[in-house]
C-alpha cells in the first residue's frame, strides 16, 4: 500500500485546515493508528494527535480543542484530521505516521500554508490645489501573507511608486499615487485595488479627487452700452467665475455705497429703472477657500436727452 496526502495545504487565516492522510492499501490490510506531528526543520517533532482504531482520537494538550476528525462517514483507512481556526503560527511542516497491519509503518509530509488576507487602508494626501507640482494624491497600504499586490484604477494621469516591508510572517506593501493637480481632475475617482490569493475578489477603496482652484472673474451685462440708458428696466450685471469649492460672490461699488434699490442675488446685481445715480464703478469680488478674484466694470447710464442730437445726426447721415 501507499499513503496519499498533499504536498501543500493552503488555508485562509481563521478557516479550518484539512490535513489529508489516506492509506491506500491492499484488501485485508488495516490501519492500527495514525500519529500526527509538526516537524519544522531545526525543531523537534511536536505531537498533534493520535488516531487509534480502537481508542479513537487523542489530542495533545498544546492542540486541545483544535484538532478533530472529519465528520462521518469515515473510512477506517483515512487518517486525515481537521485543524480548527488556522493561525499564522500553524504554518509549517506536518507529518503523518501510519501503522498498518500487516504491511508496517508509512509516513508522509505536507506543508501547511496559512494565507493572511490584507485589510487595506487608503490615506489621501494633502488638499490638492491647482498650481502645485507633482503631489501625493493618496497612498494605499495592505499587509498580508504572502505579500499582496497593490495597484491603482483611475482615468487620471499620474505616477505610482511602491515599497514593501517584510515582517517575520507577512509583508506590507505601500503604493503611492502622485499627480500634477488640475481642475479637470475634479470628481474623478482614484481607486486602490488590492489583490491577494486569500481574497475571493479584489478589495477596492475609492478616493474622489478634489482640486481647489478659482478661475478669473469677469462681468457680463455691459456688452451693449447703449442699453444702459435712463429709465431702462431689468438691467443686470452677472459675475462669471468657476471654482472648487464653489465660490461665493460679493458686489461693491468702488466710488461709494451701492445705490438704493440695487439688489444683490449671489452672482447677479439687479438694477431698478436706471437713473444717472447708477453710473459708477462696480466690483465683483469672488472668493472660495482657495483664493479670491476681483473684476470691475464701469457703468455709464446714458441720458437720451443729451444724446438725441447725435442720434438725429446719425439717422440723417444714413
Amino acid at each position: 500500500g501507499e499513503l496519499e496526502t498533499s504536498d501543500v495545504v493552503t488555508v485562509v487565516l481563521g478557516q479550518d485546515a484539512k490535513l489529508p492522510c489516506f492509506y491506500r492499501g491492499d484488501s485485508g490490510e488495516q490501519v492500527g493508528q495514525v500519529a500526527w506531528a509538526r516537524v519544522d526543520a531545526g525543531e523537534g517533532a511536536q505531537e498533534l494527535a493520535l488516531l487509534h482504531s480502537k481508542y479513537g482520537l487523542h489530542v495533545s494538550p498544546a492542540y486541545e480543542g483544535r484538532v478533530e476528525q472529519p465528520p462521518p462517514p469515515r473510512n477506517p483507512l483515512d487518517g486525515s484530521v481537521l485543524l480548527r481556526n488556522a493561525v499564522q503560527a500553524d504554518e509549517g511542516e506536518y507529518e503523518c505516521r501510519v501503522s498498518t497491519f500487516p504491511a508496517g509503518s508509512f509516513q508522509a509530509r505536507l506543508r501547511l500554508r496559512v494565507l493572511v488576507p490584507p485589510l487595506p487602508s487608503l490615506n489621501p494626501g494633502p488638499a490638492l490645489e491647482e498650481g502645485q507640482g507633482l503631489t501625493l494624491a493618496a497612498s494605499c497600504t495592505a499587509e498580508g501573507s504572502p505579500a499582496p499586490s497593490v495597484t491603482w484604477d483611475t482615468e487620471v494621469k499620474g505616477t505610482t511608486s511602491s515599497r514593501s516591508f517584510k515582517h517575520s510572517r507577512s509583508a506590507a506593501v505601500t503604493s503611492e499615487f502622485h499627480l500634477v493637480p488640475s481642475r479637470s481632475m475634479n470628481g474623478q475617482p482614484l481607486t486602490c485595488v488590492v489583490s491577494h490569493p486569500g481574497l475571493l475578489q479584489d478589495q477596492r477603496i475609492t478616493h474622489i479627487l478634489h482640486v481647489s482652484f478659482l478661475a478669473e472673474a469677469s462681468v457680463r451685462g455691459l456688452e451693449d452700452q447703449n442699453l444702459w440708458h435712463i429709465g431702462r428696466e431689468g438691467a443686470m450685471l452677472k459675475c462669471l467665475s468657476e471654482g472648487q469649492p464653489p465660490p461665493s460672490y460679493n458686489w461693491t461699488r468702488l466710488d461709494g455705497p451701492l445705490p438704493s434699490g440695487v439688489r444683490v442675488d449671489g452672482d447677479t446685481l439687479g438694477f431698478p429703472p436706471l437713473t444717472t445715480e447708477h453710473s459708477g464703478i462696480y466690483v465683483c469680488h469672488v472668493s472660495n477657500e482657495f483664493s479670491s478674484r476681483d473684476s470691475q466694470v464701469t457703468v455709464d447710464v446714458l441720458d437720451p436727452q443729451e444724446d438725441s442730437g447725435k442720434q438725429v445726426d446719425l439717422v440723417s447721415a444714413s
Epitope: Q188, R204, P247
Partner: antibody, heavy 124, light 111 residues
Framework: QVQLQESGPGLVKPSETLSLTCTVS????????WSWIRQPPGKGLEWIGY???????NYNPSLKSRVTISVDMSKNQFSLRLSSVTAADTAVYYC??????????????????WGRGTLVTVSS | QSVLTQPPSVSAAPGQKVTISCSGS????????VSWYQQFPGTAPKLLIY???KRPSGIPDRFSGSKSGTSATLGITGLQTGDEADYYC????????????FGGGTKLTVL
C-alpha cells in the same frame, strides 16, 4: 433663487431606456456637482450618480453598467439615462445639487438643493 | 439592506426631545462628514444638517447633529407636530461599493 426641475416621461416600458432632464434656473450650473437620486414607492433614498459641471462622472456601482449622466452647460441642464429598465426601477427620481469637497482630512459632501421629483413607472 | 443603519421608527410627545441614530463603519461615517435630510410625505427631501453638526439658514436650532466614531446622531428638541416626517442620514463610503450612501430612513411620529 436657484431652482431645479425634473422633466421626462412618466411611463417607460421594460427593457427600454429611461431619460430625464434636470433644468437649473436662477443660477449657474458651473462650479457644482449635480446628482440624481431615486426613491422607490414606500422605500428609502438611493444615490444614482453625479456629474461635475466639467463633465466628470461617478456612478453607484450597483447601477454603473446602465447609467449615463451628461451635462449641457449652454442650456443649464443635466440629464440621466438608465438603460434596460425593469419594474424595480419604478421610483420618484430627484435631481439635486451637491456641495462636494475634500478638505484634506474628510469629505464634505451634501445635497443642498433638490428638485421636486418626478415619478417614473416602468410597465408594459 | 442599507450600509448605514437607522431605527425604522421613533416617537415622542410634543415638547419632548428625540434622537435618531445612524450607525456605519470606518469606510463611511468614521472618516467623513455626515448630513441629515427631512422628508415630508409626497415632497422632496430637504437638507437639515451638514458637516456633522451645521444647520443651513432657515433650519431652527431645535435641530442638532453630532458624530462620534462610526455613528452619528440627529437630535430634535421641543418636538412639534410639524416635525413628523422621515429622516435620512447620508455620507460618502469609500469601500468596495464606493459611493454616496443613505441610511434606511427613520419615521418620526409625534404622539
Amino acid at each position: 433663487q436657484v431652482q431645479l426641475q425634473e422633466s421626462g416621461p412618466g411611463l417607460v416600458k421594460p427593457s427600454e431606456t429611461l431619460s430625464l432632464t434636470c433644468t437649473v434656473s436662477g443660477g449657474s450650473i458651473s462650479s457644482y456637482f449635480w446628482s440624481w437620486i431615486r426613491q422607490p414607492p414606500g422605500k428609502g433614498l438611493e444615490w444614482i450618480g453625479y456629474i461635475y459641471y466639467s463633465g466628470n462622472t461617478n456612478y453607484n456601482p450597483s447601477l454603473k453598467s446602465r447609467v449615463t449622466i451628461s451635462v449641457d452647460m449652454s442650456k443649464n441642464q443635466f440629464s440621466l439615462r438608465l438603460s434596460s429598465v425593469t419594474a424595480a426601477d419604478t421610483a420618484v427620481y430627484y435631481c439635486a445639487r451637491d456641495f462636494h469637497h475634500y478638505d484634506g482630512s474628510a469629505y464634505r459632501w451634501y445635497f443642498d438643493l433638490w428638485g421636486r421629483g418626478t415619478l417614473v413607472t416602468v410597465s408594459s | 439592506q442599507s450600509v448605514l443603519t437607522q431605527p425604522p421608527s421613533v416617537s415622542a410627545a410634543p415638547g419632548q426631545k428625540v434622537t435618531i441614530s445612524c450607525s456605519g463603519s470606518s469606510s463611511n461615517i468614521g472618516n467623513n462628514y455626515v448630513s441629515w435630510y427631512q422628508q415630508f410625505p409626497g415632497t422632496a427631501p430637504k437638507l437639515l444638517i451638514y458637516d456633522n453638526n451645521k444647520r443651513p439658514s432657515g433650519i431652527p436650532d431645535r435641530f442638532s447633529g453630532s458624530k462620534s466614531g462610526t455613528s452619528a446622531t440627529l437630535g430634535i428638541t421641543g418636538l412639534q407636530t410639524g416635525d413628523e416626517a422621515d429622516y435620512y442620514c447620508g455620507t460618502w463610503d469609500s469601500s468596495l461599493n464606493a459611493g454616496w450612501v443613505f441610511g434606511g430612513g427613520t419615521k418620526l411620529t409625534v404622539l
